[in-house]
């Protein structure tokens, strides 16, 4: 037999708090236990679930925990079941809501000395007590001219005055706990003698020049007075008119009229109602200028063919909002099809070569109209008027090649040489109109051009073969000024190349033949033995049949190279004393010397007292300090060649005699002493 | 101006030859090779050679190799053509030109005035 | 050798008209490519060279085209001083060599 030894017990319980229904069985074979609430089998949930045989709650709800819970156990084998006692939650709660106005049935219908009643709808279990507060306050019952239901949580105000406007609100507590009003009821009675609005101005634009009605009205029992004052609190009468109101108007009815408002207008105007009791009432009311900015400017559009594009106005900055829509030829556009506009858009679907020309945006307000053009290309796919050709160009002259195409928009040429792209320099140069220029021809230039012609739509391209057209020149052009060394063997070479193979022949300019000493080799000039006699001007003349006949004249000195008589050498000076650097060199012609120093030419015309150089070439610095250590260059040339030798100059400081050292003791070193 | 001078009409005997001359004046003789065309009666022109005044260096058609010797004196601007071993077929009108050029090629211009050798026995 | 053909070898115009005469190289000959006139009793007459210069002193009816092969000698308004004889001449290689002529004569 089934017995329980723990049956579930009705108990109070909270809202939203834990509970637990607890149920044990024993039993000879295996149960399962389960539980029904009011004969309904119970399903876990995250709230609700079994715990062992019990029945966990998470949190106790009022609504779908009120019932009778009963435990079942059931033997699954002889089908004996057995069911424990019933089981109840007294379930405590409180719930808050808002104050709402019982009697009269609408707002409206409150009038002084009528009956108002309000109703605290804060509900609990077990029933709470209600407490009524008016801004804030606590109201006791049996206060004159107000009752407390606590049965019927109301509230009346009997009969209701202006004194007992304001915001009420309830508390109510239990057992359970305490809540107060969720929403509060405003009551408001009025004094038939304070001023109460019967119309409030209202903000006003108007375009400048134009006239702008304010309305304003009260009502009160007697009549209310009105008052009507601008920004800086002066008073506008039809009598006494500030000196920038002067076109204002107040009518009997209250309303204000400004005619021909200017910019000094503008502002807040306050109209004042006063009644013979109670607060004054002030409203306010704002005239604005209508303003309207300019549009900013649009860039050119390029659009390709049977695309889809947009074109955003920006609506000028204005009072009030200006409205905006596009035109295009005068018509304005639809707000549907293929050209349309949609909201500040400009909308082109499926573009066509017909939709390019120019489309305008208006806006407009009170205060005037704007408008602003945006020119829309359609971009076409460029076409041929004049391909590169397959060219033969002059080498040194300028070459052309062309590359005219026509498109929509004005078509964007670029060039490639042997596939890289080339970009403008001194020897290269694009046309407006598409044609490369090659400033001179080189050689090389013979290659493969291509152009290719862009727009937005597409491009095409076309490439040529150049041919250089070699002219006859020297390669490289002889030196026109040349040295031979007297006594030495000598060349002085002369090649050229044109489409034919050239011939080269020396000659004296003067037309004197070459000595038997001098060979003319296959454009080689050669000198077994150079003598005086063979300086003098020569003439490289290099010709063939189909380009004629090229010169190149050559000055040819006989000299003798340079050599050092004198070198300097490393030099050790006291400071303060003279060093002496030497150098002379013989050539002819005869050379000039110079001396570097610290890595500078040392000019003779700037180099102070201290420093002198010789005319044998030899260099002397008087006084010398530590700074003029270093390495000094002798530096030999004349017309011909050029030579140099270096040596460093040291400066130390004068030692002091030991007393161990002889009066005659050399110093460790090459020593000038002056 | 540039002018080129030829000496006048021959009439040579087969096997004989000719020399015909062309002085050069108005430009530097030097500067600009001398090139020979002949013309047979109503037919059109044959290239025959150039020499250089300068270098002396000459170029001969292949079909008068060995039968023609170009040559000039600097001293008094003036281009000689021989021409060796005539037959009949030499007749026609010997003209001299001088070969204006750019560096890049070169045209005939001007042209002497032509000398007339026919052959005949 | 490079051989020039020139056509026709002769042709018949009137004074007034307009004359084309083209010559073809055997080889690319690049822009080198001299015009000669020459008259009954006178030696050849530099017209055009390089192809399409016009020699200092003949009159700009004359106009010269082409490159590579094809070549062309134009005369805009034939002019009675024009009837002769007409030469090519390519100056590209050694040796230089002329066409055959072309002869134009009064209608």
């Known amino acids: 037999a089934i017995v329980f030894i723990k049956q579930p017990s009705s108990q109070d319980a909270l809202q939203g708090r834990r509970a637990l229904l607890r149920c044990e069985v024993e039993a000879p074979g295996p149960v399962h236990v389960y539980w029904l609430l009011d004969g309904a089998p119970v399903q876990d949930t995250e709230r609700r679930f079994a715990q062992g045989s019990s029945l966990s709650f998470a949190a106790v709800d009022r609504l779908q925990d009120s019932g009778t819970f009963q435990c079942v156990a059931r033997d699954d084998v002889t089908g004996e079941e057995a069911r424990s006692a019933n089981a109840s939650f007294n379930i405590k709660w409180i719930e808050a809501g808002p104050v709402v106005l019982k009697h009269p049935a609408s707002e409206a219908e409150i009038q002084p000395q009528t009956q108002v009643t309000l109703r605290c709808h804060i509900d609990g279990h077990p029933r709470p007590t209600y407490q009524w507060f008016r801004d804030g306050t606590p109201l006791s019952d049996g206060q004159s001219n107000h009752t407390v239901s606590s049965k019927e949580r109301n509230l009346t105000l009997r009969p209701a005055g202006p004194e007992h406007s304001g915001l009420y609100s309830c508390c109510a507590h239990s057992a359970f706990g305490q809540a107060c009003s969720s929403q509060n009821f405003t009551l408001s009675i009025a004094d038939e003698s304070f001023a109460r609005v019967v119309l409030a101005p209202q903000d006003v634009v108007v375009a400048r020049y134009e006239e702008a009605m304010f309305h304003c009205q009260f009502s009160a029992q007697p009549p209310p007075s009105l008052q009507w004052l601008f920004e800086d609190e002066t008073p506008i009468t039809n009598r006494s008119r500030p000196p920038h109101l002067r076109r204002a108007t107040v009518f009997a009815n209250g309303s204000l009229l400004l005619t021909q408002v200017r910019p000094r207008n503008a502002g807040i105007y306050r109209c004042i109602g006063q009644g013979q009791r109670g607060p004054p009432i002030i409203l306010e009311a704002t005239l604005h200028l209508a303003e309207i900015e300019d549009m900013p400017l649009f860039e050119p559009r390029v659009f390709t063919a049977g695309s889809e594009e947009r074109v955003t106005c920006l609506p000028p900055k204005g009072l009030p909002e200006p409205s905006v829509w596009w035109e295009h030829a005068g018509v304005r556009l639809p707000t549907h099809g293929r050209v349309y506009q949609k909201g500040h858009e400009l909308v082109l679907a499926n573009i066509a070569e017909s939709d390019a020309g120019v489309y305008t945006c208006h806006a407009a307000n009170l205060a005037g109209q704007r408008r602003q053009d945006v020119n829309i290309t359609v971009a076409t796919v460029p076409s041929w008027l004049k391909k590169p050709q397959d060219s033969q160009l002059e080498e040194g002259k300028p070459g052309y090649l062309d590359c005219l195409t026509q498109a929509t928009p004005k078509p964007t040429v670029v060039w490639y040489r042997n596939q890289m792209l080339i970009s403008e320099d001194s020897r290269f140069e694009v046309f407006k109109n598409g044609t490369l220029r090659i400033n001179s021809v080189e050689v090389y230039d013979g290659t493969w051009y291509r152009c290719m012609s862009s727009t937005p739509a597409g491009s095409i391209e076309a490439q040529a073969r150049v041919q250089v057209l070699e002219k006859l020149k020297f390669t490289p052009p002889p030196q026109p000024q040349q040295c031979m060394e007297f006594d030495k063997e000598a060349t002085v070479p002369c090649s050229a190349t044109g489409r034919e193979k050239p011939t080269i022949k020396w000659e004296r300019a003067d037309g004197s033949s070459l000595p038997e000493w001098v060979t003319d080799n296959a454009g080689t000039l050669h000198f077994a033995r150079v003598t005086r006699d063979d300086a003098g001007n020569y003439t490289c003349i290099a010709s063939n049949g189909p380009q004629g006949q090229i010169r190149a004249h050559v000055q040819l000195t006989v000299a003798v190279f340079i050599t050092f008589k004198v070198e300097p050498e490393r030099t050790t000076v006291y400071q303060g004393h003279t060093a002496l650097l030497q150098c002379e060199a013989q050539g002819d012609p005869k050379p000039l010397i110079q001396w570097k120093g610290k890595d500078r030419i040392l000019d003779p015309t700037k180099l102070g007292p201290r420093m002198h150089i010789f005319q044998n070439g030899s260099l002397v610095i008087h006084d010398v300090a530590p700074e003029d250590s270093g390495r000094y260059t002798c530096i030999a040339g004349n017309s011909c060649n050029i030579k140099h030798t270096e040596a460093p100059l040291y400066v130390v400081d004068k030692p002091v005699p030991e007393e161990s050292e002889g009066p005659g003791s050399p110093p460790p070193y090459k020593m000038i002493q002056t | 101006q540039v002018q080129l001078v030829q000496s006048g009409a021959e009439v040579k005997k087969p096997g004989a030859s000719v020399k015909v001359s062309c002085r050069a004046s108005?430009?530097?003789?030097?500067?600009?090779?001398i090139h020979w065309v002949r013309q047979a009666p109503g037919q059109g022109l044959e290239w025959m050679g150039w020499i250089s005044p300068n270098s002396g260096g000459t170029n001969y058609a292949q079909k008068f190799q060995g039968r023609v010797t170009m040559t000039r004196d600097t001293s008094i601007t003036t281009a000689y053509m021989e021409l060796s071993s005539l037959t009949s077929d030499d007749t026609a009108v010997y003209y001299c030109?001088?070969?204006?050029?750019?560096?890049?090629?070169?045209?005939?211009?001007?042209w002497g005035q032509g000398t007339l050798v026919t052959v005949s026995s | 050798d490079i051989q020039m053909t020139q056509s026709p070898s002769s042709l018949s115009a009137s004074v007034g008209d307009r004359v084309t005469i083209t010559c073809r190289a055997s080889?690319?000959?690049?822009?080198?490519l001299n015009w000669y006139q020459q008259r009954p009793g006178k030696p050849p007459k530099l017209l055009i060279f390089t192809a399409s210069s016009l020699q200092s002193g003949v009159p700009s009816r004359f106009t010269g085209s082409g490159s590579g092969t094809d070549f062309t000698l134009s005369i805009s308004s034939l002019q009675p001083e024009d009837f002769a004889t007409y030469y090519c001449?390519?100056?590209?290689?050694?040796?230089?060599?002329f066409g055959q002529g072309t002869k134009v004569e009064i209608k």
């Open positions: 001449q390519q100056s590209y290689s050694t040796p230089p060599t």
């Open positions: 080889q690319s000959i690049a822009i080198y």
């Open positions: 030109a001088r070969y204006d050029y750019d560096g890049y090629s070169g045209w005939f211009d001007p």
């Open positions: 108005g430009y530097t003789f030097t500067d600009y090779f």
